[in-house]
Each structure stands twice: as structure tokens, then as C-alpha cells.
Interface confidence: medium
């Protein structure tokens, strides 16, 4: 069986986690990928999912989440914004295939996110200015329900899975504060 | 494996600006974090920013912010860093150092170790 | 910013030496640690990434461990090639931060 990985990222409450998944260009570049959490005892539940077929580096924002699959490069990034305690757990990127149950990308991504100041905008000196401009779209997160003995994934409330985003700009002050540290099971 | 190549050195006066080129060539641009180091006379090495070409978003330390601008030109391969508002303790060798960020599965992250530097280029500020 | 410390700032040694380097950090970085040597008048080279992997083309006389707070660059055998400076350098949050370097020297 496959040895599966995590990497650690130990971040604060307000920061930005930033990472991404790599996935093989020529099967998955415009195959459906989501982002999902598995908590304890719990099967996979999608957070956020990119369309189908996935736009080439066209931002898709579910809440806090945003996702961006990069075609030519293979690679989706994904950003959880404004962390909070609650966001702590195991995540991962997947790769949707129906009817057979979805890819996973390795590793997966155990999140900490602890209380404790992490500046303002602007204040803090490791923060980056950047802001990101996602497109004045509505983003429907369509993503599909799979259940098997191995995988089940839910999609996201309806509350969250509309997202209307006329003009907005997201201010992503802590891209760079994160502490990354991988952990081998 | 990618190769840098920076720009020729640069006489500056106080209060100008200089801007340096650093030109990737032998690899794939966008799968690299490209950073700006710089380094005083006598000193030690000293990290200004940086920039993910494939996202166009830079990086920069709190010392530098507002001052340097480092940007990326896609079609042509190449990086480059502004300073501004020179003053003589910005004399220094500057670098461009790459990361190569694209795993073959994971690698969750976009800079580490700066693994190819640039020859470097002498900026000299003086009156 | 997270600071790095590196002692000692000079060594003098001889050729076939084994020499020691560290580098601690103030505060936890896992294994996110660079090692470079750098000679006059030279760009830094990559020797050692997650503190402890190797670059390519790296001869093994080099060697890094540590995690957490304290890293050590090793030498087993000094060869004439070695004398140069060294720097450690963070990668596990920004801004990236580098040690002051130290520097070997012929005894």
C-alpha cells in the first residue's frame, strides 16, 4: 500500500494557508479537483471544488477557500484565508473521476491553527500587500457526492456554495507565514 | 537544470533607483520562486523578497517594503528587482536565486532552499 | 523574524580536519534549514536543503542534522576546496533569514 504523508503547518488565527497540489498533466489537467477536510472518524467532506471541466487558473472561492488549477504547470493552489481554530485538521486535494472514486494527491496537509496575535494588515513584518483580485463572478460549487466503503465525500452547504463576488478583492496580508514541517506516518 | 544570468553593474547616485535583471534560462520559468538577496560589503547575506512568476505575487521583507518592486516578465524569462531611493548602505552585490517549486506529487510549498544563485550584480551608491 | 545564530564566526583548520558548524534558531523551524558556501568574490552554492538532504553534486564529506532550533554542517575531512565561508538560512517562514556566517580559514 501506498505510505501515506502529511506535511504540518502550524499557523495562526488570521493568517493565510497557501499551499498547492501537484497532480500528472496529461490525465487530470481539466479534471474536476476539490479540497477536502477528514476529520476524525469521518469520511472526506468537500469543502470547495474547481468546475467542471476545471478552467485553466480561473479563481473559484467557496467562503473562505480559493482554488485556482493551473493547467499548463499541473498544479492546483489552494488558499484558506482569515484561518480560524476551527479550521485545524487533515486535508487533502483530490482529483474527481466518476465512476470511479475520486485521486487523491499527496500529502495531505495537517492544518494547526493556534489563537495568538497575528498582526493586522499592513502591521505585521512578515505580512505581503498583495492583494488578489478575484473575478466578479458567482461560483456555484457543484461538486459531485461519491459514496463507497473507501471514500465519502459531501458537498458543502448551500450556504456556502454560492458565492457572489461582484468587484471584491480579497486582502491576503499573511501569504508568507507559513511554517511547514512534514510529518511521516 | 535552470541558469541565471543578472545584469551589469550600476554607479548610482543617492536618491535614484537601479533596477537589476535576472534571466532564467535551461528550465521552466514558472516552477520557480525567483529571490533577491543582497549582500554589503564585508557582510552577510541579507534576503529582500521575492516572486512566484506563475501567480505574479512578490514577497518582501519588512526592510525593503515600499522601497523595492520585483516583478517578473513572463514571455521573456526574466526577473527583475527595483530599488529606490538609494542611499550608501544600499552599495552591495545583489542576487537572484531560484526555488524550484514543482514536485512530482506534493511539496506544499513555493520557496525554500535557494538551490541556483545568479553571478550577482555590483551596485555601487555614491555622491 | 526569526533569527539565526551561527558559531563560530571563524575557525582556523587543516586539510583532512573534521570540522563542525551550527546554527540555532530562535525559534522552531522543523527541518527547514539551507546550508551555503561561499567564496570570495563568488555567488553562494547550495550545499544542504531540509537540513539534512544533500544537493546534487554535493561531494559527501558534507553533512547536515538537526531540527527544531539546532543544526550542524559537518565536514569529515577538510579538503583545500572547503576553505570558505558558510551560511545557514531558514526557509520555514519569511522574512527568509540567513546566519551571519562563518568562516573557515587555513591553520
Known amino acids: 500500500a501506498t505510505k501515506l504523508t502529511e506535511e504540518k503547518y502550524e499557523l495562526k488565527e488570521g493568517q493565510t494557508l497557501d499551499v498547492k497540489c501537484d497532480y500528472t498533466l496529461e490525465k487530470f489537467a481539466s479534471s474536476q479537483k476539490a479540497w477536502q477536510i477528514i476529520r476524525d472518524g469521518e469520511m472526506p467532506k468537500t469543502l470547495a471544488c474547481t468546475e467542471r471541466p476545471s478552467k485553466n487558473s480561473h479563481p473559484v472561492q467557496v467562503g473562505r477557500i480559493i482554488l485556482e488549477d493551473y493547467h499548463d504547470h499541473g498544479l492546483l493552489r489552494v488558499r484558506m484565508v482569515n484561518l480560524q481554530v476551527e479550521d485545524s485538521g487533515l486535508y487533502q486535494c483530490v482529483i474527481y473521476q466518476p465512476p470511479k472514486e475520486p485521486h487523491m494527491l499527496f500529502d495531505r496537509i495537517r492544518l494547526v491553527v493556534t489563537k495568538g496575535f497575528s498582526g493586522t494588515p499592513g502591521s505585521n513584518e512578515n505580512s505581503t500587500q498583495n492583494v488578489y483580485k478575484i473575478p466578479p463572478t458567482t461560483t456555484k460549487a457543484l461538486c459531485p457526492l461519491y459514496t463507497s466503503p473507501r471514500t465519502v465525500t459531501q458537498a458543502p452547504p448551500k450556504s456556502t456554495a454560492d458565492v457572489s463576488t461582484p468587484d471584491s478583492e480579497i486582502n491576503l496580508t499573511n501569504v508568507t507565514d507559513i511554517i511547514r514541517v512534514p510529518v511521516f506516518n | 537544470q535552470v541558469q541565471l544570468v543578472q545584469s551589469g553593474a550600476e554607479v548610482k547616485k543617492p536618491g535614484s533607483s537601479v533596477k537589476v535583471s535576472c534571466k532564467a534560462s535551461g528550465g521552466t520559468f514558472n516552477r520557480h520562486a525567483i529571490s533577491w538577496v543582497r549582500q554589503a560589503p564585508g557582510q552577510g547575506l541579507e534576503w529582500m523578497g521575492g516572486i512566484i512568476p506563475l501567480f505574479g505575487t512578490a514577497n518582501y521583507a519588512q526592510k525593503f517594503q515600499g522601497r523595492v518592486t520585483i516583478a517578473a516578465d513572463e514571455p521573456t524569462s526574466t526577473t527583475y528587482m527595483e530599488l529606490r531611493s538609494l542611499r550608501s548602505e544600499d552599495t552591495a552585490v545583489y542576487y537572484c536565486a531560484s526555488s524550484y517549486f514543482y514536485g512530482s506529487g506534493s511539496s506544499n510549498y513555493y520557496y525554500y532552499g535557494l538551490d541556483v544563485w545568479g553571478q550577482g550584480t555590483t551596485v555601487t551608491v555614491s555622491s | 523574524d526569526i533569527q539565526m545564530t551561527q558559531s563560530p564566526t571563524s575557525l582556523s583548520a587543516s586539510v583532512g580536519d573534521r570540522v563542525t558548524i551550527t546554527c540555532r534558531a530562535s525559534q522552531g523551524i522543523s527541518s527547514w534549514l539551507a546550508w551555503y558556501q561561499q567564496k570570495p568574490e563568488k555567488a553562494p552554492k547550495s550545499l544542504i536543503h531540509?537540513?539534512?538532504s544533500l544537493q546534487s553534486g554535493v561531494p559527501s564529506r558534507f553533512s547536515g542534522s538537526g531540527s527544531g532550533t539546532d543544526f550542524t554542517l559537518t565536514i569529515s575531512s577538510l579538503q583545500p576546496e572547503d576553505f570558505a565561508t558558510y551560511y545557514c538560512?531558514?526557509?520555514?517562514?519569511?522574512?527568509?533569514?540567513f546566519g551571519g556566517g562563518t568562516k573557515v580559514e587555513i591553520k
Open positions: 531540509a537540513a539534512s
Open positions: 538560512q531558514q526557509y520555514n517562514s519569511y522574512p527568509l533569514t
